[in-house]
């Protein structure tokens, strides 16, 4: 005859407050006879949770039918769970006596612990926008977990990173713990589009992890290059000139035409392009009145990109004689 | 819900034997010890022994010995309690009972069989 | 035989009345284990006796917090705070610390 063992499989059960919790036991035989009771604690002062010939256990159900015979599962259920819940349960055999039974073995007992699911992690990003090739830190903060055990990862765009740094508080016993991460990432010129995720894995979320995200959009900025080019072709007496505003971000822009250092007011057509990766383009056109003009003429297209220094661009016009005589032809 | 349903009123000759059931449901009756007691009319409660159905293992009250046999079936959920050599001061009611060494007592009751021995 | 002298025999009262019963034993009822295996029991008429009170003073599943049991070695008391309707009937003292069993004589407790 195999001799009896009482299996608790969960060392530890992590519960939340208002649920069920499951405390399993089974035993391997069914001698010797006698009844298997839930304790809470061990030694003279340990709390009777379940007996099945007590009536007074109105949260306690067992998870099979006691009564039949050959039944070897002495699980049972705790609903509505609480803090006085926590503590550490164990199923007891005992062998039938008289004039009273007789401990026979004990489970290795299952501890029961409130456990807290993380609250939704929350990114923050910098406070200011950076150019591609500078770093920037991200925080990631989620509060109210219990254990404290937790796994926290960094990705951006699926790669996870590894320069961050985390700190869970408190170090010592609480009800509920906080975690603080803070990622250091490289800008790349293309990552307008690109995100940052903070990861949070706890034994609470049964491995359905809690993300954060960030859009490194409000991170980045992605300064535009300027090329200015005259239309080999003239319109009449006007020369069209391009200044092309390439591959920026945010798209907050404004551009000015300058004529020999004069500003010009009038209206210039332009349109907004937005690339594959997010960025900007911006092409702005400017007619030349030459039929007047002299031969030095110098045209500068000046943008100002998200309330950063001005860029500019200059361009020497060049207007042949022969161009002259056309407008002069063209002229009544 | 734990129930000992017990066999009904009999009425014997004096010298004559009978034997009485007492069959539980709710439990298995090799988790508890089967108590027979007697109360005759107006009297107070006599201890007749008791019976363990696990084992078939026995004990008697020393006035009993001879006069009562316990037997139990684990198969049926019966006990059994046979008296013999029946005479008048063996008219009561009699009473199975499981013992559960929880308690230490005897916490569950039949309702009783009653036996009236005539001459 | 450990016999069980449980006084009075009986004990006539107005509902509401605490009551109570004392039930001495000729030799204490402390066990090997340190357990007392002394037992109170009602028995209302045309009924099987009901455990009420096991181990001296645990009361059993179901039964009102008006009923306690008090005692040690040889001495024990059941005591009824409020008597109840549903109360009346004959109480018995039980010990199994020794073998054979062995019940008191009974108190009935009945309205005056």
């Known amino acids: 005859e195999e001799e009896l063992q009482m299996i608790q499989p969960e060392k530890l059960l992590l519960v939340t407050v208002g649920k069920t919790a499951t405390l399993h036991c089974t035993v391997t035989s069914l001698l010797p006879v006698g009844p298997v009771l839930w304790f809470r604690g061990v030694g003279p002062g340990r709390e009777l949770i379940y007996n099945q010939k007590e009536g007074h256990f109105p949260r306690v159900t067992t998870v099979s039918d006691l009564t039949k015979r050959n039944n070897m599962d002495f699980s049972i259920r705790i609903s509505s769970i609480t803090p006085a819940d926590v503590g550490t349960y164990y199923c007891v055999k005992f062998r039938k006596g008289s004039p009273e039974n007789v401990e026979f073995k004990s489970g290795p007992g299952t501890e029961m612990a409130l456990g807290a699911k993380p609250s939704a992690p929350v990114v923050l990003g910098p406070a200011a926008r950076t150019t591609p090739e500078h770093t920037v830190s991200f925080t990631c903060e989620s509060h109210g977990f219990s254990p404290r055990d937790i796994t926290l990862k960094w990705f951006k765009n699926g790669n996870e990173l590894s320069d961050f740094q985390t700190n869970v508080d408190p170090t010592g016993q609480s009800v509920a713990y906080s975690i603080r991460s803070t990622a250091r990432v490289v800008l790349d010129p293309w990552d307008v589009r690109s995100q940052v995720i903070c990861e949070v894995a706890h034994v609470t979320l049964q491995g359905d992890p809690l993300r954060g995200t960030a859009n490194l959009s409000e991170a980045i900025r992605v300064p535009p290059t300027l090329e200015v080019t005259q239309q080999p072709m003239r319109v009449g007496n006007q020369v069209n000139v391009t200044c092309q505003v390439r591959k920026f971000y945010p798209q907050s822009l404004q551009l000015t035409w300058s004529e020999n250092g004069n500003v010009c007011q009038r209206e210039t057509a332009s349109t907004l392009t937005e690339n594959k990766d997010g960025t900007y383009n911006w092409t702005s056109w400017f007619l030349v009145n030459i039929s007047d003009q002299r031969d030095d003429v110098v045209l500068t297209c000046q943008v100002k990109h998200d309330g950063q220094l001005a860029v500019s661009k200059r361009l020497a016009l060049e207007v042949t004689v022969h161009q002259k005589d056309q407008s002069s032809d063209a002229t009544p | 819900e734990v129930q000992l349903q017990q066999s009904g009123t009999e009425l014997v000759r004096s010298g004559a034997s009978v034997k009485l059931s007492c069959t539980t449901s709710g439990f298995n009756i090799k988790d508890y010890y089967m108590h027979w007691v007697k109360q005759r009319p107006e009297q107070g409660l006599e201890w007749i022994g008791w019976i363990d159905p696990e084992n078939g293992d026995t004990e008697y009250a020393p006035k009993f010995q001879g006069k009562a046999t316990m037997t139990a079936d684990t198969s049926s959920n019966t006990a059994y309690l046979q008296l013999s050599s029946l005479t008048s001061e063996d008219t009561a009611v009699y009473y199975c009972?499981?013992?559960?060494?929880?308690?230490?007592?005897?916490?569950?009751w039949g309702q009783g069989t009653s036996v009236t021995v005539s001459s | 035989d450990v016999v069980m002298p449980q006084t009075p025999l009986s004990l006539p009262v107005s509902l509401g009345d605490q009551a109570s019963i004392s039930c001495r034993s000729s030799?204490?009822?402390?066990?090997?284990?340190?357990?007392?295996?002394l037992h109170w029991y009602l028995q209302k008429p045309g009924q099987s006796p009901k455990l009420l009170i096991y181990k001296v003073s645990n009361r059993f599943s179901g039964v009102p917090d008006r009923f306690s049991g008090s005692g040690s070695g040889t001495d024990f008391t059941l005591k009824i705070s409020r008597v109840e309707a549903e109360d009346l009937g004959v109480y018995f003292c039980s010990q199994n610390t020794h073998v054979p069993l062995t019940f008191g004589a009974g108190t009935k407790l009945e309205l005056k």
């Open positions: 009972n499981a013992y559960d060494g929880y308690y230490g007592a005897m916490d569950y």
């Open positions: 030799q204490s009822l402390v066990h090997s284990n340190g357990n007392t295996y």
